[in-house]
Each structure stands twice: as C-alpha cells, then as structure tokens.
C-alpha cells in the first residue's frame, strides 16, 4: 500500500549503507524524494528486528526491490512503501 508521508524540512539520513537486506527481514520502506530542504533522495528501511537503516538509493539491490514493489503495487504489498509528498 502506497501512502503519503509528511516530514520536516531537512535530511533524515546522516549515514547510508549499501549492504543488502533480504525483503523478509524488512517491515517497511520510506522513500523521501529530494527537495523539501534535503538535496538528495533518501530511503529509510525499518527492519523486523526493530532497527532502522538508511540505504544508499544507488545500491542495486534496493533499486531492484523498489522495482518489484512498484510492479506489485496494485496488490497488497508485504513491505509497505511510504513516500514523502512534496507540496
């Protein structure tokens, strides 16, 4: 399910990781497009062990995963994707 996510006008990620995380260990993914006070796109991953990580948007695995999720967005997703709306 795609939902709108509002956030404050600043970057959320201090550090980014490109290390692969299997989808079964991911609770949800938040995509923050650049703009709204942050000059870069950010991807925040909530994991099933309750930890949170910022993922490098250029990491191949997250790009593949996002593409799969986009293709499946017409049905119920196991990994909800949250997007920030830019006013």
């Amino acid at each position: 399910v795609l939902e709108v996510y509002y956030t404050s006008l600043r970057c959320r990620c201090v550090q980014e990781s490109s290390v692969f995380i299997p989808r079964r260990f991911i609770d949800r993914i938040q995509i923050l497009p650049r703009g709204n006070g942050c000059p870069r796109k950010e991807i925040i991953v909530w994991k099933k062990n309750k930890s949170i990580v910022c993922v490098d948007p250029q990491a191949e695995w997250i790009q593949r995963m996002m593409e799969v999720l986009r293709k499946r967005s017409s049905s119920t997703l196991p990994v909800p994707v949250f997007k920030r709306k830019i006013p």
């Epitope: 290390v19 692969f20 995380i21 299997p22 989808r23 079964r24 260990f25 994991k47 099933k48 062990n49 930890s51 191949e60 695995w61 593949r64 799969v68 499946r72 049905s75 119920t76 196991p78």
Partner: antibody
Framework: EVQLVESGGGLVQPGGSLKLSCVVS????????MAWVRQTPTKGLEWVAS????????YYRDSVKGRFTVSRNNAKSSLFLQMDSLRSEDTATYYC??????????????WGQGASVIVSS | DIQMTQSPSFLSASVGDRVTISCKAS??????LTWYQQKLGKAPKRLIY???ILQTGIPSRFSGSGSNTDYTLTISSLQPEDFATYFC????????FGAGTKLELK
C-alpha cells in the same frame, strides 16, 4: 566441496545452556547471511535465527528472543548459537544453513548434518 | 505471522505416477516460495526456489508453479529415489515451513 559441520549438541536440563557451533568450508563464509533451523517430529521445521554478513544484524523467532543469541566469526568461518534458559520445547535437531550472498543471490542453499539438542530432567 | 498449509500430509503413489503437492499461504507471499525434499536422517535438500526456479542438479521432472497464496510442486514421473518427505517454505516475511508431505510407495 561446500561443507557445514555442526557440533555442541547434547543433553541439558531445563533452564540450562548450550552453545552450538557450525564450521563451514568450500565457500566464502563472510559473503553469506546464515541461519539456524530446527526440526522436531511434532512441530516439523522451524526457522530459529538469522545473521547478516558481519554479524551486526540478527533476527529471531519470537519463542527464542531473549534466550538465544546467534553470532559468527568470519575469520574462522564459524557460526554459533548460544542457547540459554532452555525449555523442553527447544528439544530438536538444529541445522545451520546458508542464506543470500552479499548481492542478494540465493543460488546456493547448503545445510549442515544437524546437531541434536535434548532438554530434559 | 504467515501460516503455510500443506496438503496432503501423506501421499501413496507408484513409480511413474504424476504427483502434485500443494501449499497455501495465509496471505500473498509474492512467489517467494521454496520446495525441499528430505530423506530420513538427512538435512533437507532444496529442489525449487522463487516458486519455479529449479535448483542446479535437480532433475527436470520436478517443477513448481503458483502465485499469490497458492503454490504447487509437481513430480511428472515418480522415480524410486523420489519417495521422501517434501516441505514448502515461504520467505516473504521471515520464514514459515509447511508441515510436510510424506510420499510413500503404494
């Protein structure tokens, strides 16, 4: 040849502790997520825990959270499962197995031969 | 948690038969399903992953299909070495195994 060899199983009293080890060879251990899976005649196969490449990320089934700890030593190509506060329902054969590699590929699926854990007074 | 319902629990068949084993998930698992074969006293052996990808070295008489919540393993022509227990595994959210299907010689 890919090999995973478990050790450390045995008989332990309820409330006791046991540490399982899994030594691997034939592939680059640090490239793979690893997991522990257990099996009983009554409950069948159950995932127990998983760990990422460097050991910084761990995941557990609810019934073992706070009692079991999965860890790894990449220099020694070894995976561990520390089991504390053991219960009779933890009695099972415990297998270590490979998961995805660093690129997300799941081409390899290798299992150990299993280690028997019996929790009984 | 995702539950996996596997059927049948027991299956009697003869060499040369075509057999199918089913797994039904409690929610959409997006084809993230694996099939294993296990023989007595041995570790499980992966046959198929991602619903229909045949593991290297597994004979082509094994095939998998399905989508959403319903998945099937088919053995097109049973061989003597195929009599074993078969398990499904969902890997969409953590892990859940099916209870198993014991395939016996009729």
């Amino acid at each position: 040849e890919v090999q995973l060899v478990e050790s450390g199983g045995g008989l332990v009293q309820p409330g006791g502790s046991l540490k399982l080890s899994c030594v691997v060879s034939g592939f680059t251990f640090s490239d793979y997520y690893m997991a522990w899976v257990r099996q009983t005649p009554t409950k069948g196969l159950e995932w127990v825990a998983s760990i990422n490449y460097d050991g910084g990320d761990t995941y557990y089934r609810d019934s073992v959270k706070g009692r079991f700890t999965v860890s790894r030593n990449n220099a020694k190509s070894s995976l561990f499962l520390q089991m504390d506060s053991l219960r009779s329902e933890d009695t099972a054969t415990y297998y270590c197995k490979t998961e995805e590699d660093y690129d997300g590929s799941y081409v390899m699926d290798a299992w150990g031969q299993g280690a028997s854990v019996i929790v009984s007074s | 948690d995702i539950q996996m319902t596997q059927s049948p629990s027991f299956l009697s068949a003869s060499v040369g038969d075509r057999v199918t084993i089913s797994c039904k998930a409690s929610q959409n698992i997006n084809k993230e399903l694996t099939w294993y074969q296990q023989k007595l006293g041995k570790a499980p052996k992966r046959l198929i992953y991602n619903t229909n990808i045949l593991q290297t070295g597994i004979p082509s008489r094994f095939s998998g299909s399905g989508s959403n919540t319903d998945y099937t393993l088919t053995i097109s022509s049973l061989q003597p070495e195929d009599f074993a227990t078969y398990f499904c595994l969902q890997q969409s959210s953590l892990y859940t195994f099916g209870a198993g299907t014991k395939l016996e010689l009729k």
